[in-house]
Amino acid sequence: GIAIPRNSGCPNSEDKNFPRTVMVNLNIHNRNTSTNPKRSSDYYNRSTSPWNLHRNEDPERYPSVIWEAKCRHLGCVKADGNVDYHMNSVPIQQEILVLRREPRHCPNSFRLEKILVSVGCTCVTPIVHHVA
Amino acid sequence: GIAIPRNSGCPNSEDKNFPRTVMVNLNIHNRNTSTNPKRSSDYYNRSTSPWNLHRNEDPERYPSVIWEAKCRHLGCVKADGNVDYHMNSVPIQQEILVLRREPRHCPNSFRLEKILVSVGCTCVTPIVHHVA
């Protein structure tokens, strides 16, 4: 669960009656104002381990749309445009928090949920196991 | 904001008094049970665009610990272990949701916040701008 800091001006978190359910303000504060707007925009195509982005939509979840990366190749792309199977394209995955409507369809009640998403791909040296 | 589905068994979301603040159950449901446990574990070291993971801690945020990737090189690592500066290591970034305590230090009141995190690095062909 969430580690709760102690503060005399707040309810005691050890209290048996302390809510497992908290209030969350949905006016999202975006901290990304100073970031490069291009970000990873075209990396998916320029990478030696390029990927496609698949739209995963679920109206019962916030955010309702999540983009999942799928590596295009098992190998990595060389400078000449050919696939090199001595290297492997692999997805970089990250666990993210989403809000899941609970009960279903209700707009003002949610449960925190952790899901694993593939964000992009990277090119790695394979671990080679030879037959004795 | 969050797109609200209509459901006759729930409060009307168009109501002026409809809360901007919702209830969120903090018992996190983890959907990642069937995923490959290896995941991205050692990719940061085996990648041609390797990265280091930096711990970003903030007790006023959930999750309080977020790992940020920083690419080790400007170029990409070749098979012989040397860095190739004709290619670029770049961070793959993703916008994620976190919960920010609001008011500060209070355990049962939060605001949704979007932050941009670097998840790992990938090797890309640089965009070359030639001088006319």
Epitope: P50, N52, K70, C71, R72, H73, L74, V77, G81, N82, V83, Y85, N88, S89, V90, P91, V124, P126, I127, V128, H129, H130, V131 | N36, K38, Y43, R46
Partner: antibody, heavy 120, light 111 residues
Framework: QVQVQESGPGLVKPSETLSLTCTVS?????????WNWIRQPPGKGLEWMGY???????SYNPSLKSRITISVDTSKNQFSLKLSSVTAADTAVYYC?????????????WGQGTLVTVSS | IIVMTQSPLSLPVTLGQPASISCRSS???????????LHWYQQRPGQSPRLLIY???NRFSGVPDRFSGSGSGTDFTLKISRVEAEDVGVYFC????????FGQGTRLEIK
């Protein structure tokens, strides 16, 4: 139903270039597939020659790399094989085939094959 | 290049009896993403090959459930629980984890 169909000359002279075309129907050549050439010398096993993917990336069998070119013509929904400097060892049934290139990475549809004989 | 070695090269089987074909690779076929890209194909006499099993044990659509695949790493097996007359032909294992390669083929015939 997906269909792939090879076409091209059945006889090629030694040292010349073998050229084959594969026409794809029932499937856009630009969707998530790789388009392969695989050959089978008479009475022998299968040899993977190479492929071109929906994104235009190619991969070739290292043993043929200096002689092989695979290209795609999206307007005609076709892909082609060129194999230069052929010898009698290149006599085989040549198959074009579709590889599911998004998850399983296996060839799921094959053409019926065309026999190419290298002889003077 | 990965060498795929099949055994036996010839397999005479009585109708209704089981059959088993082994395939061994010279290197592990486990990709860095955790998947194993080992496939089985059937080539009936005078026909093109046809996909039977993909990624070790998954039956391709339309393939009867008497065909099954198993194995891991470098050792893989194709089993036919009860051989039927239409199963006669050559069976190839293939890998696409590395540069794609095929086994030399196993000829299944009826005794």
């Amino acid at each position: 139903q997906v269909q792939v169909q090879e076409s091209g000359p059945g006889l090629v002279k030694p040292s010349e270039t073998l050229s084959l075309t594969c026409t794809v129907s029932g499937n856009s050549i630009t969707s998530y597939y790789a388009w392969n050439w695989i050959r089978q010398p008479p009475g022998k096993g299968l040899e993977w020659m190479g492929y071109i993917t929906y994104s235009g990336t190619t991969s070739y069998n290292p043993s043929l790399k200096s002689r092989i070119t695979i290209s795609v013509d999206t307007s005609k929904n076709q892909f082609s094989l060129k194999l230069s400097s052929v010898t009698a060892a290149d006599t085989a049934v040549y198959y074009c085939a579709r590889e599911e290139y998004d998850d399983i990475y296996a060839v799921d549809y094959w053409g019926q094959g065309t026999l190419v004989t290298v002889s003077s | 290049i990965i060498v795929m070695t099949q055994s036996p090269l010839s397999l005479p089987v009585t109708l209704g009896q089981p059959a088993s074909i082994s395939c061994r690779s010279s290197q592990s076929l486990v990709h860095s993403n955790g998947n194993t890209y080992l496939h089985w194909y059937q080539q009936r006499p005078g026909q093109s090959p046809r996909l039977l099993i993909y990624k070790v044990y998954n039956r391709f659509s339309g393939v009867p459930d008497r065909f099954s695949g198993s194995g891991s790493g470098t050792d893989f097996t194709l089993k036919i629980s009860r051989v039927e007359a239409e199963d006669v032909g050559v069976y190839f294992c293939s890998q696409s984890t590395h540069f794609p390669t095929f086994g030399q083929g196993t000829r299944l015939e009826i005794k």
